[in-house]
């Protein structure tokens, strides 16, 4: 059966830093989502080989991609407190398959010591609520991404 390997299980990062989330599968996908879990799950990105990736506006200009849909690394930059949450990879196949999740804890720099990851993978029953909208940079610098996309930051 198809599986999604996702790493890391958990990461603690200061405000303004970046985080890498990797989603790996054995292939045979149509595409892959990174979703932020919570009472109302939000799709953060959709990536399909040969197609310009689509991103949630909250992450406009803050996401890079590298690899392919079978082995995709998503880098989220300039993290904000409101980005704290559990992110899971969702492989689009005949039957959707999910990764184990990555708990991203974004902390104020001075509070780094008291809120750190344990080694256990995040549990789906105890997921933080998705953040409310946050300020977005202007997107317009402005020509289109090439198709297929380069692994560079979106405008």
């Amino acid at each position: 059966a198809q599986e999604v390997q996702q790493s890391p299980h958990c990461t603690t990062v200061p405000v303004g830093a970046s985080v890498n989330i990797t989603c790996s599968t054995s292939g045979g996908l149509r595409g892959i989502y990174l979703r932020q879990l919570g009472p109302q799950p939000q799709d953060i990105i959709y990536y399909e080989d040969g197609v310009v990736p689509t991103t949630d506006r909250r992450f406009r200009g803050r996401i890079d991609f590298s690899g392919s849909q079978d082995n995709l690394t998503i880098t989220m930059h300039r993290l904000q407190l409101s980005d704290t949450g559990t992110y899971t990879c969702q492989a689009i196949t005949e039957v959707n398959v999910y990764g184990s999740g990555t708990l991203v804890l974004v902390t104020e720099e001075q509070s780094q010591g008291w809120h750190r990851c344990s080694d256990a993978p995040p549990r789906a029953s105890a997921l933080p609520a998705p953040p409310t909208g946050s300020a977005l940079p202007d997107p317009q610098t402005a020509s289109a991404l090439p198709d297929p996309p380069a692994a560079s930051a979106l405008p």
Epitope: R30, G31, Y33, R35, Q40, P41, Q42, D43, Y46, E48, V51, V52, P53, T54, T55, D56, R57, R60, Q90, I92, N96, L136, D138, P139, Q140, A142, S143, A144, L145, L154, P155
Partner: antibody, heavy 122, light 110 residues
Framework: EVQLVESGAEVKKPGASVKVSCKAS????????MHWVRQAPGQGLEWMGW????????NYAQKFQGRVTMTRDTSISTAYMELSRLRSDDTAVYYC???????????????WGQGTLVTVSS | QSVLTQPPSASGAPGERVTISCSGS????????VYWYQQLPGTAPKLLIY???QRPSGVPDRFSGSKSGASASLAISGLRSEDEADYYC???????????FGGGTKVTVL
């Protein structure tokens, strides 16, 4: 080949509801938002809302809040738009359109259905 | 009343250049991409310009889009009879959290 095929024309009485379907083929249905846009006779295009076929999440234009419901059936790659409490000024061609682009919800509609004429008349 | 403002009509003789304007605000055109659609009589709209100035494959280079501040424009050079259609601009609106359209411009080839 990407195709969006809508259901046939409908005639409804004021106060009734109508449900229009849009069957998608030729691409990963759950990978792209489906938008609904309508056009009254001789008038311009009016965005009604979208559905995210992956999650089922929706976003409706304020004008249609409370009257429109967008759903999907991923097993048959079909999106639906139901409009209730119909009035004569809801007479229009209703289009489904696939949304692509850099951001979810962007009005970058690369494929459109053929349109469904809904006539509201007593 | 449309959120984006377009002139209701524009015209030109074959071979001429016609420009259609689309005026918005800082919450839509001013901070987001603009899209242009062509609608021939009795047909569904067709994407003409995306990301403000990009043409999908198959769209002739006679069509070009540009954007400055909170306004955008579509130019059709070397006007041809088959360009006679309605043209609509669209953009995301940050305030409304959704797409908005212009009222449309009918282009007539004289």
């Amino acid at each position: 080949e990407v195709q969006l095929v809508e259901s046939g024309a409908e005639v409804k009485k004021p106060g009734a509801s109508v449900k229009v379907s849009c069957k998608a083929s030729g691409y990963t249905f759950t990978g792209y938002y489906m938008h609904w846009v309508r056009q009254a006779p001789g008038q311009g295009l009016e965005w009604m809302g979208w559905i995210n076929p992956n999650s089922g999440g929706t976003n409706y234009a304020q004008k249609f809040q409370g009257r429109v419901t967008m759903t999907r059936d991923t097993s048959i790659s079909t999106a639906y738009m139901e409009l209730s409490r119909l009035r004569s000024d809801d007479t229009a061609v209703y289009y489904c359109a696939r949304g692509v682009g850099l951001w979810f919800g962007e009005p970058y509609f690369d494929y459109w259905g053929q349109g469904t004429l809904v006539t509201v008349s007593s | 009343q449309s959120v984006l403002t377009q002139p209701p009509s524009a015209s030109g003789a074959p071979g001429e250049r016609v420009t259609i304007s689309c005026s918005g605000s800082s919450s839509n055109i001013g901070s987001n991409y603009v899209y242009w659609y062509q609608q021939l009589p009795g047909t569904a709209p067709k994407l003409l310009i995306y990301n403000s100035n990009q043409r999908p494959s198959g769209v002739p280079d006679r069509f070009s889009g540009s954007k400055s501040g909170a306004s955008a424009s579509l130019a059709i050079s070397g006007l041809r009879s088959e360009d006679e259609a309605d043209y609509y601009c669209a953009a995301w609106d940050d305030s409304l959290s959704g797409p908005v359209f212009g009222g449309g411009t009918k282009v007539t080839v004289l």
